[in-house]
Structures are given as structure tokens and as C-alpha cells.
Amino acid sequence: IVLRPSRVHNSEENTMRALTLKDILNGTFSYKTFFPNWISGQEYLHQSADNNIVLYNIETGQSYTILSNRTMKSVNASNYGLSPDRQFVYLESDYSKLWRYSYTATYYIYDLSNGEFVRGNELPRPIQYLCWSPVGSKLAYVYQNNIYLKQRPGDPPFQITFNGRENKIFNGIPDWVYEEEMLATKYALWWSPNGKFLAYAEFNDTDIPVIAYSYYGDEQYPRTINIPYPKAGAKNPVVRIFIIDTTYPAYVGPQEVPVPAMIASSDYYFSWLTWVTDERVCLQWLKRVQNVSVLSICDFREDWQTWDCPKTQEHIEESRTGWAGGFFVSTPVFSYDAISYYKIFSDKDGYKHIHYIKDTVENAIQITSGKWEAINIFRVTQDSLFYSSNEFEEYPGRRNIYRISIGSYPPSKKCVTCHLRKERCQYYTASFSDYAKYYALVCYGPGIPISTLHDGRTDQEIKILEENKELENALKNIQLPKEEIKKLEVDEITLWYKMILPPQFDRSKKYPLLIQVYGGPCSQSVRSVFAVNWISYLASKEGMVIALVDGRGTAFQGDKLLYAVYRKLGVYEVEDQITAVRKFIEMGFIDEKRIAIWGWSYGGYVSSLALASGTGLFKCGIAVAPVSSWEYYASVYTERFMGLPTKDDNLEHYKNSTVMARAEYFRNVDYLLIHGTADDNVHFQNSAQIAKALVNAQVDFQAMWYSDQNHGLSGLSTNHLYTHMTHFLKQCFSLSD
């Protein structure tokens, strides 16, 4: 008998395994990034794995601990901040999340010179926001909606505002709608470059209607959460900007910055503040009808101790085809002359590009151009401008970093990242040290993320900061799905899509298809980034094909695509998902009887409308925390894209674009509706109304609520959610458990 070995047992194929749902829920394949906490041109801080705060000097190659993990642990600190004069560190503990960006915490000040905590005049708790001045070690903080100033950490505080009141007046911090939809920060105060002045916003929410929902907790009676939340068409917050001299705060007190006349004539928003010098500040304002933005440059008048904003220093940005800006109106990056600036806005061809404004917007000099978009200006130095764009190889879902030499004429452009690790890295961001002496590049994919340190003069790589070696090793025996990014050309519209294919994908076979959709205005889902997530598992283990499609309304491909959805939300986004599905069916490997769609938030709205489109394309679908009517969502976001829900404006489309209006059409699909009861963002009201309409239409559907969970459905709810959705899809696709 001749014994012949069967296939070698440790062959690659046999040791490879598919992803499991457990892998995803445990975060087994999560990656790390490294963002240096720059403290000078050549030094940065980093929190080590064992929780020491370590200072790195790039030029000497040396590093040392400035704050031990023992000190951190003594107050249970999870975060820190070094004062610019390096005398003190604030230690942050008792983190308590509020909304998307906001949280409260307890702060301790540690004196590095003598290795002790500062005693006497300790900070109150909990604090809503705290920051060092940009020079020295002054402290500004917000406590109970009022702003306080300390000249030194051990000094008694000087109270700047006195009218702060919970849910009524907010000083130095935004209210709900400004935090979520305008500033995208937890703070609304800004130090001047040398710490002479402190600017802050005051938000008056007195007349804003309140959203109230139950928080069930563990008590006998539920608590009621009340948030001033302006829905579309409702009364908005009233904003005022003040500036105080921090050297002599009691001398003249806070001085209000005037609002440009053309803005103040009707409802308006403040959109951002940028200090230029200690005595020059730039404010951006926006009309409530968000197609007119005004950038106003104001100067300090020593004689009157006031701020003057001459009309000659007002720059108007207006959109005739949509709203002003992309998601937000871009912010200016000032040059060294302290009056001219660089800014991204639409060029005459409808692509967002960098412009240089010296006197008027009309005379702006276009710095970048092409059928692609400039996305972010990172840094302007005396001789270089660093920015990101999606120009390279015409893939809108990539991000590369470019340097334009502005010190020479004509300016020359160099792509810093395009050819560094071309297969692995096509989506970058960057972080620059003072004067761009050094910078870190953080690559998010499509390969395993990697963070590197570079010389700001030569662009030479100095060292790898984080390369995710453990992740790379862990993935060696995992059968990951294949990913491809391609485009469909349909009726003069380019639809970019990402397709995630099972590991042993065979074009001659038929696969169930799941569409994952977001689709919100100025969003982008088709990006060249690395991810091992739920849909990776569905492809790897469950053999599904997953597709993401960027349709009309999405970003970074020009204004024609972006502004196509203006005043018509819920129409073209849905059409384009349906068009793409039809094209995927034509490719021949999709089982057209097993097609599903799912989305979260705006994606829940689009998935609901797609399911109710009456096309018969979708067997089933899931909506997580969907918007169901634009009348229920925040004014700042909604009105940007939809105008006002009034008869003489756009009420008709507000009414036509609800999920409830299409209740009948859910009869022939399996629908799973999911929402957290404590969603402060997309209120549970949205799903409650969908459910009511479906019940009234006698349409069967499935639903799951998550008690006391917000828009993120975090913690144990996440595990439950993805397990539940997996069961639903497997049942829909007749896949065995």
C-alpha cells in the first residue's frame, strides 16, 4: 500500500479563516494612528502605552518622561494638556459625555517645576471646557455656562460672564444646534495668538422650542431630558460675539463685535472665528437662508477699546446654485501680511478650489484648478502652502497631500504623498509642527494604516510612528473580502461605487447583495480607506456582496453633483441607489431575488425611501435611527439644503419627502426599524411616526428600540444591534445560522 499524503494540513488555505461577528464586536482588527501633540517646531508629546507622557525631540532623537503614569493614575487622568510655557499640565478625569463633542470633566493642575499639584484656588467641578492661553499659562474655563479666567493656575478666578444659565444662555460653549451643525466643537471661545484677548460667543436659547424625551434609568420614575432644539422653521438661537482684554479684564469688560449690516437685517448665524494677530480678528457670518456668507475682518481700536469692522473688509461669498460652501463654509488661512488669506470655494466651473484673496473676492487669484477638488488647507508658511485634494489619478475617494511653493513665481506644485506607499496608502491626513518644520502623515488606507514623521523642508521620511504590525500579523490568517472601487456612467452622472466581494468570489456564481447607504449632502462613502467592520464580516463569512454608492448630493466631485439635491432631499439620492442596483444586476453575479439595503441616520432615511420606492428591487432592508420627515430635524442642517417649511418657500417638498407618506409601499418588503429612545440628534419621534404610519396602513414590519441610547447606539447596544441585524439579513437571504 502506498500512502500518499493528502493536502498538507498547514497549507495557507487550511489555516486561513473567515471573519466572525465576534471579531468585529470585540474590535479584534482595529487599527491605531499616531498624531503627535506638537509643542514646538521640533518637539511633540505622546502618551505611551503604559500611560507616561513622553516628550520627543526630533532633532536630537532623544525622549524623556515629563509626567509619570503614577501621577496620571493618582487622579485617574485620561487626558492632559501642557501649558505653552511648560510650567503646568492640566489633568482631565471624570469624563462625562454630553453630546457629540461636548463633555464635562474634573481638572487638576500639576506644577512640573516642583512635581506637585497646585493647591489653593482649585478649579470647580465639573467643568464644561478648559484651555490654556497660546502663550504662558493663563487659563480660560467654562463652568455652569459662564466663562472664568485665571492669570496663573494658583490664582483666584476672574469671572467674565454672569448671565449663563442652563438651557438658556451659553457663554463660551455652543448650544446643541451650534455644536452639532455649525461649529463642530465643544467650545465657543478663542484666544488671540499671544493671549492678549479672549473672544467668545454667547448663545441665547430663551425662545427656542424644547425637545423633551424620557430617560428611563433605574429609578421609579423616568427623568425628562429637555434640550432647546430648533427644528426646521423654528425660532433659532440668538448669537453675539464678545472680546475681552485678558491682561486687564475688569478695565472695560467684554466688547461686542458688530455684525455686518447685510447679515443683521434678518435671521443669521455666526459660523467661525479666526484670529489673525492679537489686534485683528476675522469673523464669519451666514444668513439663515444659507446661500450668503460674509467674512468680516475687524481691528482693535486702542483709543476706544472697541472692535471696528469696516465694510471695506467684508468679503461676501454667495452661491447661486445651492448653499454656501460644502458641508460648512470654509475658513480662511491668513498669510504673513495679516490681511490676505487663502480660502477654498467654488470656481467658475463649479469645483471647490483654493483661492488667494488680497483685496476683494472678485479679484481672487485661483491657486488650484481642475475637475477635482481641494479639500483642506493644512498650513501656510512663508514659502509653502500644504493642502489635500483628490486630484491624483482622478479618484474622488482618495486624499493626497500637496505642497505649493508660494515663495517663488510661478508657484510650483508637488504631491508629497502620491508615490510614497502607492498601493498601501491613498488616503492621507497630516499634522504639522510650528512653521511646518516637521509633519506627521497619517495614512488611512486602503492598506493597513501607517503613521510617519517627515522633514518639512525636504519631505524626507524620518521615522515610522505607528505601522500596526500586530494588526498585520493578526490578519495573516484571515480571509478578508476583496474590495474594488469603480465607477458607473449613467445619464451624464458618474456614480462611484465600492464593492466588497467574498474571498472566493466567482463571477459565474450568484450572490446576495447588500447596499450600505448614507447619501447625505456633502458626504462621501466611497473612500480608499482600510476597515474591518460588519460588512467585511458579511462578505467574508456570509458570502454577501456589499456595495456603497456615491450618488447625487455627495461631495468632492463638483457642484453639479453636490447641489443636485438642493431643496429636493430624498429624491435623487434614492434614484441613484436604485440605478446602481440595476447596473449591479446587469453585471451577472447578483441574485436579484436577494437584494437588501441598510443605512443609519441619513442612510436610514434613504434606505427607507428606497424600500418604499415601489421598484420591487429590494427584498428587505434596515433603517437605523432614520430621519422620517425634515420637519423633525435641526434647522441649521435641514434649512441649508431644504429652505424653510413655509407655504411661500418649500413646505410642499417637506411634506412630499417624508417616509410616512410612503407607508403603503412597505407592504411588499421586510422592514426592520431601529432607534435609540434617548437620541438627542435624530429624535425617536422620527421612528415613532414611521411606526404609527405603518400601523395605520396595516403594514407588517419589525422593530427594535434601544432604551436610553443615543444616536450612536454604543456599548452593549452595539453588540445587540449588529447581532440582531445579522439575523435579520441571514433570514432575508435564506442563509443558515
Partner: nanobody, 118 residues
Amino acid sequence: QVQLQESGGGLVQAGGSLRLSCVASGTIFSSGAMAMGWYRQAPGKQREWVAGITGSRTTTYADSVKGRFTISRDNAENTVFLQMNNLKSEDTAVYYCNLWPPSRPDHWGQGTQVTVSS
């Protein structure tokens, strides 16, 4: 191991001047200019920071000495200086140099005594 040797202190009249020197040695200083600072401790008080200088010679001062003290360095010699002009009685203290900010665990030299008489 960090070793720091301060010198140049002494007794001086109010309004007078002194120049302090500090020689730094140890592996952390072997490959170039680390950010360095001057600190001081007055009798019965806690040690406080006075001035700082980075490897690229960017300087920062405590408000109490701004305009009177000047920090400088000789990178080749691993030496940091503190030129103190228009001295006041409240400048009386033991002066130390160290990394800026100091490392943990602490490594401090002997310091150099500055006494300003009025």
C-alpha cells in the same frame, strides 16, 4: 543619567546684573540641543520656572522676569546661560537649570545661590 552643573551666582545689589551658566551632561544631551530651562526656589517657597529655550533658540519667560532676564545657549558646549539685569530683592533664590520641562523622575543639580540686597 542627567547631570547639571550651575554656576555664576553671588551677592549683588538691587539693580545689578549677574550671568548664570549651566553645563549639562548625560546621554540625553549627547546628540544635540534639548529644550532647557532656568528655575528658581526662594526661601520658604516652591520651585518655579523662570525662562526656557528650545534647541532652535526660541525663548519664553515668566512674566516676573520678562524684559530683565535673557536666556541663551551654546549648543556646541551644551551650556545654557541666564543673563539677569536690573535684579530685584524678590529675585533672591537658588537658581537651577534643567530640561524644559523637567524629566521624571527629577534630576536636579546643586543650584547656584543668587542674593539681591537692597
